[in-house]
């Protein structure tokens, strides 16, 4: 009898009530492997979850998070709320980054600004809650009389030709 069940393909279950005939999974259920004695109930993507892939007879539904949330955990088992750039999610909700830290994403924690002086550089552009500082040449490079074999090219956005 066990051999009969092992012949049941994915998308079916071995129905003990019907002499171990392979019966198709009922609506809203699936079996992803052969030889199953029951079909599993499909996952429902409700609330802050939305359906990324519908359930089929051979595979479970896959969920995503609605706008304003992002996935956490295996197979998007949880949705965590987004915060604005310049904020981090704390136990009491979204809070602005403290001075000296930044977050340029809608998730994750605020990180300290880069310490330019550790690399012997100076701050070219100050940091904000949303952006890290931009480090420039070292103060020595900027002092009068400092020799430079090739002066630095003006900064330009990638893909733009010089004027």
């Amino acid at each position: 009898l066990q051999d009969l069940c092992s012949n049941c393909p994915a998308g079916t279950f071995c129905d003990n009530n019907r002499s171990q005939i392979c019966s198709p999974c009922p609506p809203n259920s699936f079996s992803s492997a052969g030889g199953q004695r029951t079909c599993d109930i499909c996952r429902q993507c409700k609330g802050v979850f939305k359906t990324r892939k519908e359930c089929s007879s051979t595979s479970n539904a896959e969920c995503d998070c609605i706008s304003g949330y992002h996935c956490l955990g295996a197979e998007c088992s949880m949705c965590e709320q987004d915060c604005k750039q310049g904020q981090e999610l704390t136990k009491k909700g979204c809070k602005d980054c403290c001075f000296g830290t930044f977050n340029d994403q809608k998730r994750g924690i605020c990180r300290p600004w880069t310490n330019c002086s550790l690399d012997g550089k100076s701050v070219l552009v100050n940091g904000t809650k949303e952006r890290d500082v931009v480090c420039g040449p070292s103060p020595a490079d900027l002092s009068p009389g400092a020799s430079s074999a090739t002066p630095p090219a003006p900064a330009r956005e990638p893909g733009h030709s010089p004027q």
Partner: antibody, heavy 121, light 112 residues
């Protein structure tokens, strides 16, 4: 799966104190707020307060300040509600309710089965 | 404290018929982040409360689609399109916008 198992019924004398426990499993205890809710017989629900087990931070309903004390033991994933100077109006069912910070920080998703407290001489 | 007023106190409904419960708050439940923390819970006889809806209209996992939540500001509604026997119990609205968080007085749904 998430489970909240509360301690059994309590019969205590007026003026005494009681400590109700809520043992949890199936989720990250330290990083989810645990709430306590009171329900008097045949009446509605009243929020007592909440505790963040990670650092012991608490928020109380002003009505329960001095009456209720919330604590948590991270090593056993257990939250506690202590009620002091008990009178008959404290007789009620007390629920622990997990707050799931993964969606928001403001709603209940799992509840304990409730602990019945009877204050009587 | 924010007072949550539910109406009616009792609702007697025939199975298969619709039902509607109102919940009014004494001040707006719109939080500073643009979200409204209004939930609906059901307490079946002898059981713990169970969340049905959060953020006004988001259905909890496993809650049938016959339940819908709507509203904004201070006026909110829970609707059941076709009442079933398992729906009987006491329905509570709950606000988590303002401390202390508060519940409505409850609406008892009875089956005719």
């Amino acid at each position: 799966q998430v489970q909240l198992q509360q301690s059994g019924p309590e019969l205590v004398k007026p003026g005494a104190s009681v400590k109700i426990s809520c043992k949890t499993s199936g989720y990250a205890f330290s990083t989810s707020w645990m709430n306590w809710v009171k329900q008097r017989p045949g009446q509605g629900l009243e929020w007592i307060g909440r505790i963040y087990p990670g650092d012991g931070d608490t928020d109380y309903n002003g009505r329960f300040k001095g009456k209720a004390t919330l604590t948590a033991d991270k090593s056993s994933s257990t939250a506690y509600l202590q009620l002091s100077s008990l009178t008959s109006v404290d007789s009620a069912v007390y629920f622990c309710a997990r707050l799931d910070g993964y969606y928001e920080v403001f709603y209940f998703d799992y509840w304990g089965q409730g602990t019945t407290l009877t204050v009587s001489s | 404290d924010v007072v949550m007023t539910q109406t009616p106190l009792t609702l007697s409904v025939t199975i298969g018929q619709p039902a509607s419960i109102s919940c009014k708050s004494s001040q707006s439940l719109l939080y500073s982040n643009g979200k409204t923390y209004l939930n609906w819970l059901l307490q079946r006889p002898g059981q713990s409360p169970k969340r049905l809806i959060y953020l006004v209209s988001k259905l909890d996992s496993g809650v049938p689609d016959r339940f819908t939540g709507s509203g904004s500001g201070t006026d909110f509604t829970l609707k059941i399109s076709r009442v079933e026997a398992e729906d009987l119990g006491i329905y509570y609205c709950f606000q988590g916008t303002h401390f202390p968080w508060t519940f409505g007085g409850g609406t008892k749904l009875e089956i005719k």
